[in-house]
Amino acid sequence: VPRWRQQWSGPGTTKRFPETVLARCVKYTEIHPEMRHVDCQSVWDAFKGAFISKHPCNITEEDYQPLMKLGTQTVPCNKILLWSRIKDLAHQFTQVQRDMFTLEDTLLGYLADDLTWCGEFNTSKINYQSCPDWRKDCSNNPVSVFWKTVSRRFAEAACDVVHVMLNGSRSKIFDKNSTFGSVEVHNLQPEKVQTLEAWVIHGGREDSRDLCQDPTIKELESIISKRNIQFSCKNIYRPDKFLQCVKNPEDSSCTSEI
């Protein structure tokens, strides 16, 4: 008799999820000497314990605490780059500017980047068919709670000047409902963070507007100022040139505005 299985609205667990997490962990710990001590099999055990056998709409931050503990990592608190809706460029940037870090440059972020996972209540099976969608099913699902947990911790760790890359091509350049807008902004510590500097990335070749004057950026400035953190904003008119100049800062064309 086939078991009845809950059908969720979102895609199922990424195929070969355990193997992928383990392989990423091995690769990360080989590349980052400061994380060599991490036992990847224990990391996977903690990961599986966070969501397997649990109802995928009933996951809590507490479920991820053993994983958080094993993945504890110190990144330079003044070298943190947050991003919203512009992940690829943020990652390209930190690949060049090696002393800056996005969440996905940390072990836990690297393990889970672009993956989906969920289990089923009371079985030790991984659900490869479907997982809850944040909007259509529930917000307390394994993936959303994971990112909320690691994002909160990442923001809490930040200090001095924190940078955030925002997508100037979107209708809401700053979106209060994004992870940045709903979690990270509210977990920056005013006693540690002096300034949040937004980099607004332009999409169009001929787009010369000052997107720092956008109403949503003003809203972000207001939220940040109320938290006793200074705010500054820069337009990045030419992201391709911006990356090129990060790679080759001595290039003569890099003295002009990018």
Partner: antibody, heavy 120, light 107 residues
Framework: QVQLVQSGAEVKKPGSSVKVSCKAS????????FSWVRQAPGQGLEWMGR????????NSAQKFQGRVTITADKSTSTAYMDLSSLRSEDTAVYYC?????????????WGQGTLVTVSS | DIQMTQSPSSLSASVGDRVTITCRAS??????LAWYQQKPEKAPKSLIY???SLQSGVPSRFSGSGSGTDFTLTISSLQPEDFATYYC?????????FGQGTKVEIK
């Protein structure tokens, strides 16, 4: 039919090393992990460590760290357990046991065991 | 390390008896618990995994229950071939640990 076939009994001197092998057949070797579990005479079961051949990684119980090396050879579908600096308390039957990489289930298949006797 | 404590360490029973063995973990292990049967001079054999799931090919007289820290293995009607030693084992975290075993003997 899955089978784990272990190497034969060994008699070793204190201070020496022993290497026990476990050859797997009847399943996809790289889809599984292999643990080593030992049992001293008249005693219970004691987990020593685990290797994931597909990833080439192993871990071990703190008690054995520095003395045990667990490896696997994918080309021959064989897992190995090397225990060094042997002492009389290491006299035991050593079993290899298989579980899935994700460790979502039990040790579903076991080798027949290898008796290692440490005696001067 | 997680300690696994089984009780009793041995018991005497007759064919047809209902037998219950308990296993307690020193900290919560959710349902990451397996039960094994071992006969003299043989390798252990898996009976139950995920605390209550029956391993393929194992008779239905064996059942498991519990979650968190307290677990039970029940043999509903003891058969002659069931006289053996039974071990619980947690696979919640490393190192994997076993209970000390419960020997089921003929009364």
């Amino acid at each position: 039919q899955v089978q784990l076939v272990q190497s034969g009994a060994e008699v070793k001197k204190p201070g020496s090393s022993v290497k026990v092998s476990c050859k797997a057949s009847g399943g996809t070797f790289s889809s599984y992990a292999f643990s080593w579990v030992r049992q001293a005479p008249g005693q219970g079961l004691e987990w020593m460590g685990r290797v994931i051949p597909h990833l080439g990684i192993a871990n071990s119980a703190q008690k054995f760290q520095g003395r045990v090396t667990i490896t696997a050879d994918k080309s021959t579908s064989t897992a190995y357990m090397d225990l060094s600096s042997l002492r009389s308390e290491d006299t035991a039957v050593y079993y290899c046991a298989r579980d899935d990489i994700a460790a979502l289930g039990p040790f579903d298949y076991w080798g027949q065991g290898t008796l290692v006797t440490v005696s001067s | 390390d997680i300690q696994m404590t089984q009780s009793p360490s041995s018991l005497s029973a007759s064919v047809g008896d209902r037998v219950t063995i308990t296993c307690r973990a020193s900290q919560g292990i959710s349902s990451w618990l397996a039960w094994y049967q071992q006969k003299p001079e043989k390798a252990p054999k898996s009976l139950i995994y995920a605390a209550s799931s029956l391993q393929s090919g194992v008779p239905s007289r064996f059942s498991g229950s519990g979650s968190g820290t307290d677990f039970t293995l029940t043999i509903s009607s003891l058969q002659p071939e069931d006289f053996a030693t039974y071990y619980c084992q947690q696979y919640n975290s490393y190192p994997r640990t076993f209970g000390q075993g419960t020997k089921v003997e003929i009364k």
